[in-house]
Interface confidence: low
């Protein structure tokens, strides 16, 4: 997260860290007791490493009573996701067992109504991604409030030049932005999960390259079919 600040500890009980061989790789969001939603491209970076999900964390390194690392029973990338595009960049991870829910671990309701979020709406994005262009990684969860950007502006030739589909949404990126390591994390508007940070290698913090998020409402049928 660029231009953000340390989050209030455990105030986002849905927040997950997708880890490979014990290292944070991507963000994720707990959407059901045994399921974490993330970005499909995160798995490509995992190679053959052991994928696990950390729940109930604020600090990645410090012992915290609510923290627990779960093994992944199965990973379900969206069937249409491909390495060369950010289309359908969603991944569902089934935990080896149901998460122990509590004040610091709780699923987040996700948007099922397939309607664009009003441009200008302030949404919260959180993650353990880099906090500087130099690549400094935070130990504690960071967050930032970002205004939603209308798709037409986001698709301008000077911005993303038509790459933003109806199944994606954008947020402003003027110094405040999601960045490397935040992929798969939640974009929350009004207490509801609206978007998932895409995992492209986009430049961060440049206002002409807005943040791109996969709209979960557009994938309600797929999410329901996997969770069923």
């Amino acid at each position: 997260i660029l231009g953000g600040r340390e989050a209030e500890a455990h105030a986002r009980p849905y927040m997950a860290s997708v880890q490979v061989n014990g290292e944070h790789l991507c963000g994720g969001v707990l959407v059901a007791e045994q399921w974490v939603l993330s970005a499909a491209h995160c798995l490509e970076d995992a190679a053959d490493g052991k994928v696990q999900v950390l729940l109930g964390a604020h600090s990645l390194s410090q012992p915290e009573p609510s923290k627990r690392l779960y093994d992944v029973l199965r990973a379900v990338p969206h069937p249409d996701s491909r390495p060369d595009t950010i289309d359908h960049d969603l991944l569902l991870l089934q935990l080896s067992e149901k998460a122990t829910l509590g004040p610091a671990v709780r699923p987040l309701p996700w948007q099922r109504v397939d309607r664009d979020v009003e441009p200008g709406t302030l949404c919260d994005v959180a993650g353990w991604g880099i906090v500087s262009h130099a690549g400094r990684r935070p130990d504690r969860l960071q967050h930032v409030l970002l205004p939603v950007l209308d798709r037409a502006t986001c698709n301008r030739r000077t911005h993303h030049d038509g790459a933003i589909t109806q199944r994606m949404m954008c947020a402003e990126s003027n110094r405040r932005d999601s960045c490397k390591g935040d992929s798969g994390g939640p974009l929350v508007c009004g207490g509801v999960l609206e978007g998932v940070v895409t995992s492209g290698s986009r430049v961060c913090g440049n206002r002409k390259k807005p943040g791109i998020y996969t709209r979960v409402a557009s994938y309600a049928a797929w999410i329901d079919s996997v969770l069923a």
Epitope: E6, A9, S66, G102, P103, A104
Partner: antibody, heavy 119, light 108 residues
Framework: EVQLQQSGPVLVKPGASVTMSCKAS????????MNWVKQSHGKSLDWIGV????????SYKQKFKDKATLTVDKSSSTAYMELNGLTSEDSAVYFC????????????WGQGTTLTVSS | EIVLTQSPALMTASPGEKVTITCSVS???????LHWYQQKSGTSPKPWIF???NLASGVPVRFSGSGSGTSYSLTISNMEAEDAATYYC?????????FGTGTKLEIK
């Protein structure tokens, strides 16, 4: 009104073990962490560890790892701390303290349990 | 672990006097994670100032807190008899949580 009611003073012999209790009321017990803090006579405060009453997960200060065991009974909203292998160094007042998760400071303290270790 | 050193260890102040207690932290912490507690003899500590500068409920406005990084302070603008107590700073930045060495404040 939030209250943390601790068990009464105890006098034990060296080498013995003791369990003290802390009964919480006035709030939802599982929604806040419970910490334990030691205060030797005339000394500063020393954090022992913390327990998440919801999950039973604990974290201890290194020097108390083999000395203290924290547990809870959710049904009675009570936290417990067992201290083993007692020596005169363990003579102190022990406080149970609410804090963490929804409050990142120690907002409510029990009245303290005085432990005296003497032969 | 993070070490908190308070100074002075003991001080005496006259009624109406301005009092400042300092807390030096061994490594930089977020100001939201530095707290102060007041303890009177034979009683439990009470939360006094949290997040460096926020007064806990019922704390008189003559108290204030400030600081950042590794240096924090608690100030009483005009000392009153009821302020005589021991004050402890404490960090919530990382486990293990640690307290300052304490400052005993007495009234002249």
């Amino acid at each position: 009104e939030v209250q943390l009611q601790q068990s009464g003073p105890v006098l034990v012999k060296p080498g013995a073990s003791v369990t003290m209790s802390c009964k919480a009321s006035g709030y939802t017990f599982t929604e806040y962490y419970m910490n334990w803090v030691k205060q030797s006579h005339g000394k500063s405060l020393d954090w022992i560890g913390v327990i998440n009453p919801y999950s039973g997960g604990t974290s201890y200060k290194q020097k108390f790892k083999d000395k203290a065991t924290l547990t809870v009974d959710k049904s009675s909203s009570t936290a417990y701390m067992e201290l083993n292998g007692l020596t005169s160094e363990d003579s102190a007042v022990y406080f149970c303290v609410r804090g963490g998760l929804r409050r990142n400071y120690f907002d409510y303290w029990g009245q303290g349990t005085t432990l005296t270790v003497s032969s | 672990e993070i070490v908190l050193t308070q100074s002075p260890a003991l001080m005496t102040a006259s009624p109406g006097e301005k009092v400042t207690i300092t807390c030096s932290v061994s490594s930089s912490i977020s100001s939201t994670n530095l707290h102060w507690y007041q303890q009177k003899s034979g009683t439990s500590p009470k939360p006094w100032i949290f997040g460096t500068s926020n007064l806990a409920s019922g704390v008189p406005v003559r108290f204030s807190g400030s600081g950042s990084g590794t240096s924090y302070s608690l100030t009483i603008s005009n000392m009153e008899a009821e302020d005589a107590a021991t004050y402890y700073c404490q960090q919530w930045n990382s486990y293990p949580f640690t307290f300052g060495t304490g400052t005993k404040l007495e009234i002249k």
